[in-house]
C-alpha cells in the first residue's frame, strides 16, 4: 500500500471547482521533495499537469495551483472551471519522477442536472429571503391561497390567505398579491434556515380544479472561500451581506466545534488574541465591510464567518459569508521580533520589512488604536509629514533596495507603549505589527548631549557634544537635523587622531557638532545617534534655540526637553565636528497617507525587531519621561 493518502473519488459538476488534499508521511525528505499531480493515460503513463517545481500544463493554465503545507504534511491541488473533459484517473504523488510514491484519485465531472419541468427550484443562502411565485387561473381568484411544506405523509401549512401561519414561520412568512394582477400570488419567507429547505406546494382553490405548483427550496450554507496566506502576512475578509442588513451590527467569528466565537464586531467586542492586529471597516451603506488581520500566526488558520445582527453575535437565519483560512509556514515575510522594548527617555529603532521588489513604494508607520472599530492613524511616512505631537522625536529612514526601512522614536514615555504597524502602498502582504513596551528607566542613558542648556547666539559659534560609552566605539556616530520630513544627516569628519581601540577612555568618547556662524535657520531639533551600516541604533535629541545677542538676556531653559531625549546602542569612536550652514532635510515627500487609506488597505502583517541593542534586556536606560515641548525664545 502507498503511504500517500487522499480522496479516492472526487465528483463535481461543470463550472465548479475542487480542492484535492494529499497526505504524505512526516519526513524531512517528503516535506522538501517535488509534489505532483498527473493524469493517467491508457498506456499507463502519467502526464504531469502541475507540480511544486512550478510546472503548469497548458490545459491547467489560469485555473489550477498546487500548494505544499509542510507543517501539515499535506499538499493541495486546486482546480477551477471544471469541464467534463477533466473526468479521469489521476495520481497525486511525491518524487522527482511520476513513478514515485503516489495515490490514485478518480475525478468525475458531470453535467449540471436538468430539473423536472413541473418543479420550480429556488436556491438561496442561509439568512436570505425567498419570494415564491404561485400562478393560478382566474376562476380560482376568489378561492383560498396557501403554501404548504411536504412532510413524509402530508403537506404542513406554512401560510394561507386567511392569515393562518405555522408557528415556525411567524414573523417570517408573508402571502401577498402585487397590484391588480389576479393570476399570481406570492409568498415571501425571510431569515431562511437549513430547516426551511424542502419541497413545498402552493395552491389556489380546492378539489380537482385547484391550481398547484411544486416548489423545491434549497437553502445553502455559503461555500467557504479558500484563502491561502503566508505566516506573518495579513488577510482581509471582504464581507458583502446585502443592503437588507446595512444597519445591523457586523461581526467576524471563528468556528469551533459547537459555536462561532466572535473575534471582532462593530459594537466594540474584540478577542484579546487579536489585540493590535485587527481592524473592522464598514465600507458603504450596502452592508459591505472588511476585517483586516495582520501578523498571521499558525493558530489563526481555521473557518471564519462574517455576519450581521443587532446583537453583534451569530444568529440563526441571518446572512453569513464563510472562509477557510490556511496559514503556510513557508513564508517570504522575514521573521522579526514582534515585541520591541524601550525605556522612558530612551529610543527604539524599529526595522520594518517591505517587499524588496518594491523599493520605490511609499513607506508608512501608523499607531493601532483599539477604540471603536479600530483604526491606524499614520504617524510618519516617506510622503507623510510627522504628526505634530511627535515633533522632534520620530523619523523614518528609508534604505532603498534592501527590503527594510527604519523608524526611530525617541524621548519615549510610557504613553508610547502600544501596537504599531509598518506598511507600504505596495504589496499589502508585508504589513507587519510591532508591540512597543516602555519600562521606567533605571539607569543613565548611553548617549548624553552637553550642554543640555542649548541656546545658541546668532552669528556666533556653537558646539554641542554627544558623549557615548566605549561599547559604541566601533559604530558610526552621526548628527542629524530633524524636520517633519525626516532627520537629515549632517556631514561630519574626524576631530583628529582616533584613540587606540585597545584603551578606551570613558570620559573622552564624544562626537561634536559645531554651528558656525549660528543662523536663525539653525534653530530646531537635532539628534545624535549611532548606527552600523544600515542598522540604526540609539539616538538622543536636543532642541537648540537661537537668540540674538543681548546684554543680560534670559530665556526659557529647554533642559527638561533635552534631558528626556537620551537613547542607547553600540558604535564606533569618531570625535567629529560638524559644520553646517544649510540644514537640508530630505525632499518634500508629497501627499499625506491619511488614516482612512490605512484603515482600508488590503492584506497582511507582523513581527519586527528593534535594531541592535534597542529593545534588548541590557539595552536601554533613560532619564525623565515627560513629553517634550517646542521652546520658543
Amino acid at each position: 500500500k502507498s503511504p500517500i493518502f487522499g480522496p479516492q473519488e472526487v465528483s463535481s459538476i461543470e463550472g465548479d471547482s475542487v480542492s484535492i488534499t494529499c497526505y504524505y508521511p512526516d519526513t524531512s525528505v517528503n516535506r522538501h521533495t517535488r509534489k505532483y499531480w498527473c493524469r493517467q493515460g491508457a498506456s499507463g503513463m502519467c502526464t504531469t499537469l502541475i507540480s511544486s517545481n512550478g510546472y503548469l500544463s497548458k490545459e491547467y493554465s489560469g485555473r489550477a495551483n498546487l500548494i505544499n503545507f509542510p507543517e501539515n504534511n499535506t499538499f493541495v491541488i486546486n482546480i477551477e472551471q471544471l469541464t467534463q473533459d477533466d473526468t479521469g484517473s489521476y495520481k497525486c504523488g511525491l518524487g522527482t519522477s511520476n513513478r514515485g510514491l503516489s495515490f490514485d484519485v478518480s475525478l468525475e465531472v458531470s453535467q449540471v442536472p436538468e430539473l423536472p419541468s413541473d418543479t420550480h427550484v429556488y436556491t438561496k443562502d442561509i439568512g436570505r429571503n425567498v419570494t415564491i411565485e404561485c400562478p393560478f387561473k382566474r376562476e380560482n381568484a376568489p378561492s383560498k391561497k396557501s403554501l404548504c411544506k411536504k412532510t413524509n405523509q402530508s403537506c404542513e401549512l406554512v401560510i394561507d390567505s386567511t392569515e393562518k401561519v405555522n408557528p415556525s414561520y411567524i414573523g417570517r412568512a408573508k402571502l401577498f398579491m402585487k397590484g391588480t394582477d389576479l393570476t399570481v400570488f406570492y409568498v415571501n419567507i425571510s431569515h431562511l434556515t437549513h430547516n426551511d429547505a424542502g419541497l413545498y406546494i402552493c395552491q389556489a382553490g380546492e378539489g380537482p380544479s385547484a391550481d398547484k405548483k411544486n416548489v423545491d427550496l434549497q437553502v445553502l450554507a455559503p461555500e467557504p472561500e479558500l484563502l491561502y496566506k503566508d505566516l506573518r502576512s495579513s488577510v482581509t475578509f471582504e464581507c458583502d451581506l446585502g443592503r437588507e442588513v446595512a444597519n445591523e451590527a457586523k461581526y467576524l467569528c471563528r468556528m469551533n466545534k459547537e459555536t462561532c466565537d466572535v473575534i471582532i464586531n462593530t459594537l466594540g467586542k474584540r478577542d484579546p488574541d487579536f489585540e493590535g492586529r485587527i481592524l473592522i471597516t464598514p465600507k458603504d451603506d450596502n452592508g459591505r465591510f472588511s476585517v483586516l488581520i495582520t501578523g498571521l500566526r499558525k493558530e489563526d488558520a481555521g473557518h471564519y464567518q462574517c455576519g450581521a445582527h443587532s446583537s453583534g453575535l451569530p444568529q440563526e437565519g441571518w446572512p453569513i459569508q464563510t472562509w477557510q483560512l490556511f496559514v503556510n509556514e513557508e513564508s517570504t515575510i522575514p521573521n522579526r521580533r514582534s515585541v520591541v522594548k524601550g525605556v522612558t527617555g530612551g529610543s527604539v529603532a524599529i526595522a520594518c520589512p517591505y517587499n524588496p521588489k518594491e523599493s520605490s513604494s511609499l513607506k508608512y508607520w501608523c499607531r493601532w488604536e483599539g477604540d471603536g472599530n479600530g483604526h491606524c492613524p499614520v504617524l510618519v511616512g516617506t510622503q507623510a509629514q510627522v504628526q505634530e505631537e511627535y515633533e522632534g522625536r520620530l523619523a523614518l529612514f528609508d534604505q532603498p533596495g534592501n527590503g527594510t526601512y527604519t523608524v526611530i522614536l525617541n524621548q519615549l514615555t510610557t504613553e508610547d507603549a502600544g501596537f504599531y504597524w509598518c506598511l507600504t502602498n505596495g504589496d499589502s502582504r508585508w504589513r507587519t505589527t510591532i508591540e512597543l513596551q516602555v519600562a521606567e528607566a533605571t539607569r543613565e542613558p548611553n548617549l548624553e548631549v552637553t550642554p543640555q542648556n542649548a541656546t545658541a547666539v546668532l552669528g556666533e559659534t556653537f558646539t554641542v557634544s554627544c558623549h557615548y560609552p566605549c561599547k559604541f566605539y566601533s559604530q558610526e556616530k552621526y548628527w542629524c537635523k530633524w524636520s517633519n520630513k525626516g532627520c537629515h544627516i549632517l556631514p561630519s569628519h574626524d576631530e583628529g587622531a582616533r584613540q587606540s581601540s585597545v584603551s578606551c577612555d570613558q570620559s573622552s568618547q564624544l562626537v561634536s557638532m559645531t554651528l558656525n556662524p549660528v543662523s536663525k535657520e539653525d534653530e530646531g531639533w537635532y539628534w545624535c545617534g549611532v548606527k552600523q551600516g544600515q542598522t540604526y541604533g540609539e539616538t538622543t535629541a536636543i532642541y537648540i534655540a537661537v537668540e540674538e545677542r543681548t546684554r543680560g538676556s534670559s530665556h526659557v531653559n529647554p533642559t527638561d526637553a533635552n534631558a528626556r531625549a537620551k537613547v542607547a546602542l553600540e558604535e564606533e569612536v569618531v570625535d567629529s565636528s560638524i559644520s553646517e550652514k544649510e540644514n537640508k532635510a530630505i525632499p518634500n515627500p508629497g501627499p499625506f497617507a491619511n488614516e482612512r487609506e490605512i484603515q482600508n488597505v488590503g492584506d497582511q502583517a507582523q513581527e519586527n525587531r528593534a535594531s541592535g541593542d534597542a529593545g534588548s534586556a541590557d539595552g536601554q536606560s533613560r532619564s525623565s519621561s515627560s513629553k517634550h515641548h517646542h521652546h520658543h525664545h
Epitope: 473519488e9 488534499t21 461555500e223 488558520a301 481555521g302 440563526e316
Partner: nanobody, 130 residues
C-alpha cells in the same frame, strides 16, 4: 444538541453484505463531513471511510483495509451517510462508529485521525461469522 444515530448493524456471514446508516440531527446541524470508524475488542479505533462535501463537490476516502469492498455515500439532504459493506470478512467484526464534522477543516486535517472529528455516535455492532 447534535446527535448521530447508527443503524443497520448485526450478524452477517463471510462474503455477505450489510448496509449501515448514520443519521445526523440537531436544530441547526448541517455537517460538512461524515465518516465511519471501527473498533474491534482490544484494538485501537480504525478509519474505515469518510465523505466530505462542498456545494456540488463530493470527496470520498476509503481506508486501506476495506478498499474495493466498502463504499460510502450520503443522501441528498446531506444529513445521512451510508456504508455499503460487501465481501465482508471475519476481521471486519467490530463496533462501527459514525463521526461528523460541522467545520470544513478536512482540507488540511487528515480524515483518518479520530481526534479531528467533532461528533461521534454510540456505535453499532457488526459481527461477521465464518
Amino acid at each position: 444538541e447534535v446527535q448521530l444515530v447508527e443503524s443497520g448493524g448485526g450478524l452477517v456471514q463471510t462474503g455477505g453484505s450489510l448496509r449501515l446508516s448514520c443519521a445526523a440531527s440537531g436544530r441547526t446541524f448541517s455537517p460538512y463531513a461524515m465518516g465511519w470508524f471501527r473498533q474491534a475488542p482490544g484494538k485501537e479505533r480504525e478509519f474505515v471511510a469518510a465523505i466530505r462535501w462542498s456545494g456540488a463537490t463530493t470527496y470520498k476516502y476509503v481506508g486501506d483495509s476495506v478498499q474495493g469492498r466498502f463504499t460510502i455515500s450520503r443522501d441528498a439532504a446531506g444529513n445521512t451517510v451510508y456504508l455499503q459493506m460487501n465481501s465482508v470478512k471475519p476481521e471486519d467484526t467490530a463496533v462501527y462508529y459514525c463521526a461528523a464534522d460541522r467545520v470544513p477543516k478536512d482540507i488540511s486535517i487528515d480524515p483518518r485521525n479520530p481526534k479531528d472529528w467533532d461528533y461521534w455516535g454510540k456505535g453499532t455492532l457488526v459481527t461477521v461469522s465464518s
